[in-house]
């Protein structure tokens, strides 16, 4: 018998230092590019190998980025969000939301799944 899939949502502050090739990740989302139904938030779609984000190790594909250097990412056009990152300076503080998939097995058993992407 299969259990239902639930998600454990956690928030984290991640401080990245811009590397020679930048921050090293891609994003999707925005009011004109909804990646998740009824959510115009900004999500990480790719972590580039050997980039600043990959070397730091905390930011994951599928994470939702809530703010950049304290600036809220709600209700932004996609390109405006991209520009915000590009103009964020050398030291960049990201407030991110991780969603961890938790598999609820049959009664009496609780197993943890892999992070969702």
């Amino acid at each position: 018998m299969n259990g239902r899939v639930d998600y454990l949502v956690t928030e984290e502050e991640i401080n990245l230092t811009r590397g020679p090739s930048g921050l090293g990740f891609n994003i999707v989302g925005g009011t004109d590019q909804q990646y998740v139904s009824n959510d115009s938030g900004i999500y990480v779609s790719r972590i580039k190998e050997n980039g600043a984000a990959a070397l730091d190790g905390r930011l994951q594909e599928g994470d939702k980025i809530l703010s950049v250097n304290g600036q809220d990412l709600k209700n932004l056009l996609h390109q405006d969000a991209v520009d915000l990152f590009r103009n964020a300076g050398y030291a960049v503080s990201l407030r991110v939301q991780h969603r961890l998939q938790v598999q609820n097995g049959p009664i009496g058993h609780r197993g943890e799944g892999d992070p969702s992407g």
Partner: nanobody, 127 residues
Framework: EVQLVESGGGLVQAGGSLRLSCAAS????????MAWFRQAPGKEREFVAA????????YYADSVKGRFTISRDNAKNTVYLQMNSLKPEDTAVYVC?????????????????????WGQGTQVTVS
């Protein structure tokens, strides 16, 4: 996992035209940045053209400017390369590339490292 399948290649005479298609899997195609590269025998992979997620920005190699046009149909999950005034030096395997989302760093459309999904390619021969 994104899958890219190219079609439309073939043998054409110099001065002729071809239209290549690249069909992509995935429900979020409208977030993909897409590009065409080509590789001739014994040569390095060469950037041809790129298009952003919405189709509002396009980029071309100098060697194809004014002759090739890249476009996309997000409803059909497909990107196109219209190739006119073909020359023998356009002979190559044409490969479609994609990445989900926009880089937060400087965008270098001609850099293969910008893309992490690649098709198998379609052969174009201009005689």
């Amino acid at each position: 996992e994104v899958q890219l399948v190219e079609s439309g290649g073939g043998l054409v005479q110099a001065g002729g035209s071809l239209r290549l298609s690249c069909a992509a899997s995935g429900r979020t195609f409208s977030t993909y940045e897409m590009a065409w590269f080509r590789q001739a025998p014994g040569k390095e992979r060469e950037f041809v053209a790129a298009i952003n997620w919405s189709g509002s920005s396009t980029y071309y190699a100098d060697s194809v400017k004014g002759r090739f046009t890249i476009s996309r149909d997000n409803a059909k999950n497909t990107v196109y390369l219209q190739m006119n005034s073909l020359k023998p030096e356009d002979t190559a395997v044409y490969v479609c590339a994609a990445v989900i989302g926009s880089t937060v760093d400087e965008y270098r459309p001609s850099d293969p490292l910008e893309y992490n999904y690649w098709g198998q390619g379609t052969q174009v021969t201009v005689s």
